[in-house]
């Protein structure tokens, strides 16, 4: 449906505070480094010129695309070239090749400052002098430092979190009822915005049809009950939500994934039983009780797969007339069979059961040659149950930071050329797995846990492509999406590393680490863990393990010092050496 | 819009040749699969030989099989029908088609479907 001003339609279909709220978020994940009254400034522009449009489609400018108008506006920017350099040449282009250029420079790992939050009565009296102002922030604050962050559950997010601060500021105890919150925002944020980077890079560096693979078989383990047809068509709508997401079309994006809510709700009856409760919220709320609905039932009496995709006369006939749509309902079939699978284990089956029909088809006996096929599946699925298996009893054995260190170890000796801080966020995500999956019975572990490590590893290597160090990291990232885990499992510890030179400044330690949090602690621990492997690669399990403890003790005792300074620096040099002995440094 | 258009039917007696073509356009010609399926007088559809996208998987209906051969230009957006050894129950309208998003496979009628093209083999 063509629209004579599309800034127009988009501002009358989500409302004016939508409208701001999208575009501040586009600005700020485009000009990641801009001040944040610069982009309020620039997105009261937009919603001021989207005005003069509602109220006349046919006003001058009003036809332009919103890439045309959004990017124009960018560029307005004085700064830019002063603070983003290269990214300051995207202007001299043309659209649609502006915004791909603008795309491109979207940084994962942008050079700000941590957030820090305030004191509880400083953060109250800023929401109530100017509550506008006070969740702009917020958006702007997140959009920037997560720029593929999902837009319209942004939205969401900073409900829940206007929410806290309406209710915990007038609470008697306001730190109390609003540090859990703010904390469970925080968590559920990082976790939001790792999902949707994962879905980004599997459009951008995969293309379409790895998406939609990934959806058919996610939406066909959560909606067993629907039909073929209606887990196709869902599929096709949930890709081009993302695929306007991930591009930066944030507004086209919040319209079509409301449109699908509402789509989901009217037909729910041929959808899901589960959706019950999803479809009485309100719009935000709504969208994301659909994304985490619970899998449905699966229906009684399914038939055997192999009557189909292996017994049939038809299977060759059926794979060579549409390979993607056969290829697809084999998919659909084996995933409401399996919600107790991964969702790259099923894609990983597919794409086996693909490689045989694409050799036997072409054979001299076809049914001979794939008839055995469902016996190769056997390894694929048993491979994730058993690293699980191993881990979760690692994890029970160890707890969550002992667990972590672990994966620091093992991570840092497969891969050593990366960086210090990224080695170290990587492996404490990768260890989380365990309090996150190894709690549920064996039939939820597989998909908590396969596909909870996927998005884990996506950040490794988005953190990587910025930077590449590594051949190894390059060559599992980019080779195959569905085989990153098993690729980054596979590598042994890289015998061509050339230990890093020893420095003793990177092992000196100070008496502000006493007062941080039991969290950046474990961090300034895990950041040494790692300098230590990089130096000794080929230290022991026990000699790591006896250098810690040692280094544990030794900020214990300097924390309870008299003058800790001093506790730091003394007995800090008498740890270096007796550590450098104790690893033949 | 899809468009297919078949041509090179026409009469001739048992045990003879004919060679079909099939001209696409309006859709993704290389990455489709095609069909030949065709429809003797008071009969239905009956589905004769499938080519896959890139050419490498050919399957044939019984009744044709070591007589008919399916073959594919894709720089020519065409699919053809090399038919030998004609008899007279393979007199029918021949059509070209390919999958419809959102049919069934192997549900012809619901294929894009060209206008078809008269084989007769009579003596």
């Known amino acids: 449906d063509a629209h004579k001003s599309e800034v127009a339609h988009r501002f009358k279909d989500l409302g004016e505070e939508n409208f701001k709220a999208l575009v501040l978020i586009a600005f700020a994940q485009y000009l990641q480094q801009c001040p944040f009254e610069d982009h309020v400034k620039l997105v009261n522009e937009v919603t001021e010129f989207a005005k003069t449009c509602v109220a006349d489609e046919s006003a001058e400018n009003c036809d332009k695309s919103l890439h045309t108008l959004f990017g124009d506006k960018l560029c307005t920017v004085a700064t830019l070239r002063e603070t983003y350099g290269e990214m300051a040449d995207c202007c001299a282009k043309q659209e649609p090749e502006r915004n791909e250029c603008f795309l491109q420079h979207k940084d994962d790992n942008p050079n700000l400052p941590r957030l820090v939050r305030p004191e509880v009565d400083v953060m109250c009296t800023a929401f109530h002098d100017n509550e506008e102002t006070f969740l702009k922030k917020y958006l702007y604050e997140i959009a920037r430092r997560h720029p593929y962050f999902y837009a319209p559950e942004l939205l969401f997010f900073a409900k829940r979190y206007k929410a806290a601060f309406t209710e915990c500021c007038q609470a008697a105890d306001k730190a109390a009822c609003l540090l859990p919150k703010l904390d469970e925002l925080r968590d559920e944020g990082k976790a939001s915005s790792a999902k949707q980077r994962l879905k980004c890079a599997s459009l951008q560096k995969f293309g379409e049809r790895a998406f939609k693979a990934w959806a058919v078989a996610r939406l066909s383990q959560r909606f067993p009950k629907a039909e073929f047809a209606e887990v196709s068509k869902l599929v096709t709508d949930l890709t081009k939500v993302h695929t306007e997401c991930c591009h930066g079309d944030l507004l086209e994006c919040a319209d079509d994934r409301a449109d699908l809510a509402k789509y989901i709700c009217e037909n729910q009856d041929s959808i899901s039983s589960k959706l019950k409760e999803c479809c009485e919220k309100p719009l935000l709320e709504k969208s994301h009780c659909i994304a985490e609905v619970e899998n449905d039932e699966m229906p009684a009496d399914l038939p055997s797969l192999a009557a189909d995709f292996v017994e049939s006369k038809d299977v060759c006939k059926n794979y060579a007339e549409a390979k993607d749509v056969f290829l697809g309902m084999f998919l659909y079939e084996y995933a409401r069979r399996h919600p107790d699978y991964s969702v790259v284990l099923l894609l990983r089956l597919a794409k086996t059961y693909e490689t045989t029909l694409e050799k036997c088809c072409a054979a001299a006996d076809p049914h001979e040659c794939y008839a055995k096929v469902f016996d190769e599946f056997k390894p694929l699925v048993e491979e994730p149950q058993n690293l699980i298996k191993q881990n979760c009893e690692l994890f029970e054995q160890l707890g969550e930071y002992k667990f972590q260190n672990a994966l620091l170890v093992r991570y840092t000796k497969k891969v050593p050329q990366v960086s210090t801080p990224t080695l170290v966020e990587v492996s404490r995500n990768l260890g989380k797995v365990g309090s996150k999956c190894c709690k549920h019975p064996e039939a939820k572990r597989m998909p908590c846990a396969e596909d909870y490590l996927s998005v884990v590893l996506n950040q490794l290597c988005v953190l990587h492509e910025k930077t590449p160090v590594s051949d190894r990291v390059t060559k599992c990232c980019t080779e195959s999406l569905v085989n990153r885990r098993p690729c980054f499992s596979a590598l042994e510890v890289d015998e061509t590393y050339v230990p890093k030179e020893f420095n003793a400044e990177t092992f000196t330690f100070h008496a502000d680490i006493c007062t941080l949090s039991e969290k950046e602690r474990q961090i300034k621990k895990q950041t040494a863990l790692v300098e230590l492997v990089k130096h000794k690669p080929k230290a022991t399990k026990e000699q790591l393990k006896a250098v810690m403890d040692d280094f544990a003790a030794f900020v214990e005792k300097c924390c309870k010092a008299d003058d800790k300074e001093t506790c730091f620096a003394e007995e800090g040099k008498k740890l270096v050496a007796a550590s450098q002995a104790a690893l033949g440094l | 819009e899809v468009q297919l258009l078949e041509s090179g039917g026409g009469k001739v007696q048992p045990g003879g040749s004919l060679r079909l073509s099939c001209a696409a356009s309006g859709f993704t010609f290389s990455t489709s699969g095609m069909v030949w399926v065709r429809q003797a007088p008071g009969k239905g559809l009956e589905w004769v030989s499938t080519i896959s996208d890139d050419a490498r998987i050919t399957v044939y209906a019984e009744s044709v099989k070591g007589r008919f051969t399916i073959s594919r230009d894709n720089a020519k957006n065409t699919v053809y029908l090399q038919m030998n050894s004609l008899r007279a129950e393979d007199t029918a309208v021949y059509y070209c088609?390919?999958?419809?998003?959102?049919?069934?496979?192997?549900?012809?009628?619901?294929?894009?479907r060209g206008q078809g093209t008269l084989v007769t083999v009579e003596p």
């Open positions: 088609a390919t999958y419809r998003a959102g049919s069934r496979i192997g549900s012809y009628e619901d294929y894009y």
